[in-house]
Each structure stands twice: as C-alpha cells, then as structure tokens.
C-alpha cells in the first residue's frame, strides 16, 4: 500500500504517458488522476512500467471502482491483466467476445492460470450457454478447454456449437464428457450424407452406443484402429464380428495388435472361437465350440 | 525463471566513457523491455533508461544527450553507452527486464555493476 502524499508542483499527469516510467511509487499514486488513467487504459500497455508500478494503478482503479472495473476498461488492461486475482475478477461482468480475446491475447502460449479460468467462468455463465462463438474463441486459445469442463457444464453446450471443435480439442475427454458431447454431435450432424458425416462424428464417438454403432457397420465407413480403441467397452461388447469386420474395413487387421488391450480383449472374451477364427487372424481366447452362451443380463431384464 | 548478468562497470575520469552490457537467458521470451537502473550511495533506486521490445527508448532528464540505450534482440542483450560521466553519476547500476506473460510474469533484476566516477 503507498501512502498518501501531495503531489509535487508540476509533476501532476495530465495524460497516461512515457515519462510516468519515471515517477517513484508514490508520486504516481499522488499525481496520476484515476479517472484519467481509466480512460486512457488502452495507452498502459505500450508502456514499459515495472510491476511495481502497475500495483500502484492497479490500486487506483480498484479505488475508483470498488465494485469491478466496467467493461469499458477491462477491454483495455492488456498486462495489467496479470495482475488482476480471481476475487478481483469475480466482480466483474465480460459480456463482449472481444474483450474475451482480448485478455486471452495478454496469456497466450501458455497453460491456463487461475486467472484466466476465472475469466472465462464468468463470461460463459454470463452468456448462459458455450455459444459457437465463444467455443470457438477459447478452443484456439486453450484446444483443451472443452474436456476440462464437466459432464453438468458441457450439457449447456448448445448442439449448434458442435460445429466449432477439432479433433484435437477432444484430445483429453474422457468417457463421461464424451457421453455427454456424443449426443449433441449426432443431433449437430444429421443431415450430413454417409462419408461426410463419418469424419464429423468420428471424434465423438467415444461417446456412441451399441445401436450407433451397429448402424455404421452398414455403410462402409473404415473405422480406424486409434478411433475403435476409444470406443466404449459396453457399446463395443454386443458387436458380431461380422459387425466390427463391415465397421473397420481393411482396418480390421489392427485388431490383432490390440487383442491384449481394452474393449478388443473384452470383446473377444465374448465371440464364438469359431467366428473369430473367420477374420484369419489368429485371434485367441473365444468362446470354445460347443460352449453355451447365457445372456444373463437378458434374463435379469425379463424377469 | 530469467537471469541477468551485467558487465562493463568500473572507475572512470569525468568527462570519460563506458559501456555496460546485460545479458538475459533462460526464459527470455515474452520480455516486452529492459532497462538500466542506480542506485547511488544515500539514494534510492532510480531509473535512468528504458527500452521496449519494439525499440522505443525513454531517458531520465539527468541522462538525456549522454547517455544511450540500445538493445540486440537476437542476443538478448540490452546496453548502456555512457559518456560525458560526471560524480554525481557514481552508483551501483542495475539492469532490469519485465516478462509480461505466464508462468513467470514480472520484473528481473541483475546483481549490479559498480560506476565510479572520480578523478
């Protein structure tokens, strides 16, 4: 905190500018009008203040608006952005995308900060819905930012906003996100013909159940191995093999490299040897011949 | 994290010259300006020059049309030229960088270098 101290003659600031680098701490809390200073934020960031000083105005703003800082100045902190705490943007009410981006400039190429996350909590909770825009500004930002939410904060992901992720952006989803996401992506691209709506839906397919499943076995779509190790191990189970033969295509080759590994060792544990011995693949660990299969889940379901 | 280390300080006449040099590694992108602050015997520390990254220069009044800074941004590297030296310009001289992103945003500061100007 700098003490109160009269400004000395002629060194009062007329404008935010160069030769304030030059003022002790408490000359620049003496002689800067805060009113002036949060007018003229947008003139702050092309000068080269030490920290120290930014502290100074950042307590003269916090003076001036004990509430939150108006939008107004906000969009213009640029650095002094770095200095901010999460409390201190908890007041604050971001309506404007670009004042989003503007601030997500000050962290770029770098990990989200406390900050940062606060921030954009707020802009989406004011928003009141992941809007395509604003998915689409933080997903360049930060191409985690969609698995880092929860299952309850992606279901107010508005289908219409599907079309802003990448593959990338799903990178780090688990299933329980994927579950949530799969749903909307499937809505977001139904009236895509077979091939195009194949590569759209394939990174969310993590999140697909069996009937979805069974269904793109019937249009040649090529699966490959990565995507078919993603799927859900209780979606993959009821699958025939001829149903994962017609979903992987020539990929169906893969499936030996993976038969020690989740859902494919899972799945083989409950095919007939005899029908996994079709694909030539040498795969092991089926049903032996003449075994019956029970269904017990069935049996529980009609009883 | 980012280090500085200055180079260049020693005794000099008045009316003589010398040329400090800082040299910044380690984290050293995202630095937006570097600068040269003293700090003479009784006083406390001042600034004397600043440049940005952009290479816009600002020079105290005591300074101004002796000293010079310039930057080699390639090198990381910020230098003072003084001439014209004078007593009153005697102090332990300081070099400074301010990183303006995360993970590391803030001011950095060298050991220092001793100016002493006497006849």
């Known amino acids: 905190e700098v003490e109160k101290t009269a400004c000395p003659s002629g060194k009062k600031a007329p404008e935010i500018d160069e030769s304030l680098i030059f003022y002790k701490k408490w000359e620049l809390e003496a002689c800067v009008d805060a009113a002036l200073l949060a007018t003229q934020m947008d003139r702050v960031n092309a000068i080269p203040f030490t920290y120290e000083q930014l502290d100074v105005l950042k307590h003269k703003l916090d003076e001036l608006y004990p509430q939150g800082y108006p939008e107004s100045v906000i969009q213009h902190l640029g650095y002094l952005f770095l200095k901010m705490s999460p409390e201190d943007i908890r007041k604050w009410n971001v309506t404007s995308l670009e004042t989003l981006k503007a601030l997500l400039e000050v962290n770029k190429g770098h990990e989200m900060s406390p900050q940062v996350a606060t921030l954009i909590d707020r802009f989406v909770k004011g928003r009141g819905q992941l809007d395509k825009d604003t998915l689409d500004t933080l997903t360049a930002f930060y191409p985690g930012y969609l698995c880092s939410l929860s299952p309850e904060e992606l279901s107010s992901v508005p289908p219409s906003s599907i079309w802003a992720v990448r593959p990338q952006d799903l990178d780090t989803c688990d299933p329980r996100q994927l579950d949530v996401l799969y749903p909307k992506a499937r809505l977001a691209f139904q009236n895509m013909n077979g091939s195009e709506y194949f590569v759209k839906i394939q990174s969310f397919l993590g999140g697909a159940p069996t009937e979805d499943l069974k269904a793109l076995s019937q249009q040649n779509v090529s699966m490959d191995l990565a995507t078919f190790m993603k799927l859900r191990t209780d979606a993959v189970l009821p699958l025939t093999v001829a149903e994962v033969q017609k979903l992987l295509g020539p990929h169906v080759e893969g499936l030996k490299a993976e038969e020690r590994h989740r859902p494919v060792r899972d799945w083989i544990l409950r095919q007939r040897q005899d029908d996994l011995d079709t694909l030539g693949l040498g795969l092991q660990g089926g049903i032996p011949n003449g075994y019956l299969v029970l269904d017990l889940s069935m049996q529980e379901a009609l009883s | 994290q980012l280090q500085l280390v200055e180079s260049g300080g020693g005794l000099v006449q008045p009316g003589g010259s010398l040329r400090l040099s800082c040299a910044a590694s380690?984290?050293?992108?995202?630095?937006?300006?570097m600068g040269w602050y003293r700090q003479g015997p009784g006083n406390e520390r001042e600034l004397v020059a600043v440049?940005?990254?952009?290479?816009?220069?600002s020079y105290a009044d005591s300074v101004k049309g002796r000293f010079a800074i310039s930057m080699d941004n390639d090198k990381h590297t910020v230098y003072l030229q003084m001439d014209s030296l004078k007593p009153e310009d005697t102090a332990v001289y300081y070099c400074?960088?301010?990183?303006?992103?995360?993970?590391?945003?803030?001011?950095?500061w060298g050991q220092g270098t001793q100016v002493t100007v006497s006849s």
């Open positions: 440049i940005t990254d952009r290479g816009r220069a």
């Open positions: 400074n960088a301010h990183r303006r992103t995360w993970p590391h945003p803030g001011d950095y």
């Open positions: 380690g984290s050293v992108n995202s630095i937006t300006a």
